[in-house]
Interface confidence: medium
């Protein structure tokens, strides 16, 4: 297993609609044709898998239908969007990239993006 550098922003603020987007960029040491991207969330002593997608270079990322993630790829970077976030989902979101094929296998784990989610204030009753 060979190490690979993965870069991602340190902090992202989710929109009022609970959507957060960030770029995950990896320094590909070889000519990978198949790449796997996993988003992990670390909170306290727990690491949970948020979503994962495997894609062929040049093609779109395909997450599972019920996934809260969507994404697009361009060269050695992946634009990830996580939807449906609430304040309780605030945490460190880590991008894990695996170059699956052809060999050799490379693994890279980013330092994480701290996503802050603020629940919107309920709108007061209005006559307007």
């Amino acid at each position: 297993c060979k190490a690979m550098h993965v870069a991602q922003p340190a902090v992202v603020l989710a929109s009022s609609r609970g959507i957060a987007s960030f770029v995950c960029e990896y320094a590909s040491p070889g000519k990978a044709t198949e790449v796997r991207v996993t988003v992990l969330r670390q909170a306290d002593s727990q690491v949970t898998e948020v979503c994962a997608a495997t894609y062929m270079m040049g093609n779109e990322l395909t997450f599972l239908d019920d996934s809260i993630c969507t994404g697009t790829s361009s060269g050695n970077q992946v634009n990830l969007t996580i939807q449906g976030l609430r304040a309780m989902d605030t945490g460190l979101y880590i991008c894990k990239v695996e170059l699956m094929y052809p060999p050799p296998y490379y693994l890279g784990i980013g330092n994480g993006t701290q996503i802050y989610v603020i629940d919107p204030e309920p709108c007061p009753d209005s006559d307007f």
């Epitope: 297993c1 190490a3 796997r36 996993t38 992990l40 670390q42 002593s45 727990q46 690491v47 949970t48 898998e49 948020v50 979503c51 994962a52 495997t54 599972l64 695996e98 693994l107 784990i109």
Partner: antibody, heavy 118, light 107 residues
């Protein structure tokens, strides 16, 4: 309360097959990677295999690669280990563990004994 | 593959003693190391994660330190229930590898 309960162990002849199961409860199973770890009688711990939460990524120890297959059914909260071409050296207690990746294993099952002997 | 060399393989100590167990990784693993306690016939139990973080519910007499290639588990004052076998585990990269174990026995 997190619970992991292994089953499916038993006596099998060399060259035979066995499928182990690990029923999980008390946590959102699909959010977590899972691993199998084994321990031969009187020996130390040996990691066997791991699978990511969504089941997309699988990993194996060299000693079982090509013979064992890890899988999971998230709708049933169950982890599996299909073991083929079993050898005497596969005799061990097999544990499933909730895998927090670089933070290690926070919960383990009680183990199930697999004995490979003629 | 990353090899984990654990020492000593066994030790005899008395209640109240300070006990130190060492694990050395064959290559740098950041702080991606845990310590596990196992008693006969039982599943292992995590004591320390991320080299130095104490698992919830584990007594504070257990502590871990180290980063890179050298790691230490310390029991500050050995208690009767601490007589067991201890393993380190690197979870930096696959295949995951355990140390050979340290059996702590009563002197």
């Amino acid at each position: 309360e997190v619970q992991l309960v292994e089953s499916g162990g038993g006596l099998v002849q060399p060259g035979g097959s066995l499928r182990l199961s690990c029923a999980a409860s008390g946590f959102t199973f699909s959010n977590y990677a899972m691993s199998w770890v084994r321990q031969a009688p009187g020996k130390g711990l040996e990691w066997v295999s791991a699978i990511s939460g969504g089941g997309l990524s699988t990993y194996y120890a060299d000693s079982v690669k090509g013979r064992f297959t890890i899988s999971r059914d998230n709708s049933k909260n169950t982890l599996y280990l299909q073991m083929n071409s079993l050898r005497a050296e596969d005799t061990a207690v097999y544990y499933c563990a909730k895998d927090l990746l670089w933070l290690g294993f926070d919960y383990w099952g009680q183990g199930t004994l697999v004995t490979v002997s003629s | 593959d990353i090899q984990m060399t654990q020492s000593p393989s066994s030790l005899s100590a008395s209640v109240g003693d300070r006990v130190t167990i060492t694990c050395r990784a064959s290559q740098a693993i950041r702080n991606d190391l845990g310590w596990y306690q196992q008693k006969p016939g039982k599943a292992p139990k995590r004591l320390i994660y991320a080299a130095s973080s104490l698992q919830s519910g584990v007594p504070p007499r257990f502590s871990g330190s180290g980063s890179g290639t050298e790691f230490t588990l310390t029991i500050s004052s050995l208690q009767p229930e601490d007589f067991a076998t201890y393993y380190c585990l690197q979870h930096n990269s696959y295949p995951l590898t355990f140390g050979g174990g340290t059996k702590v026995e009563i002197k």
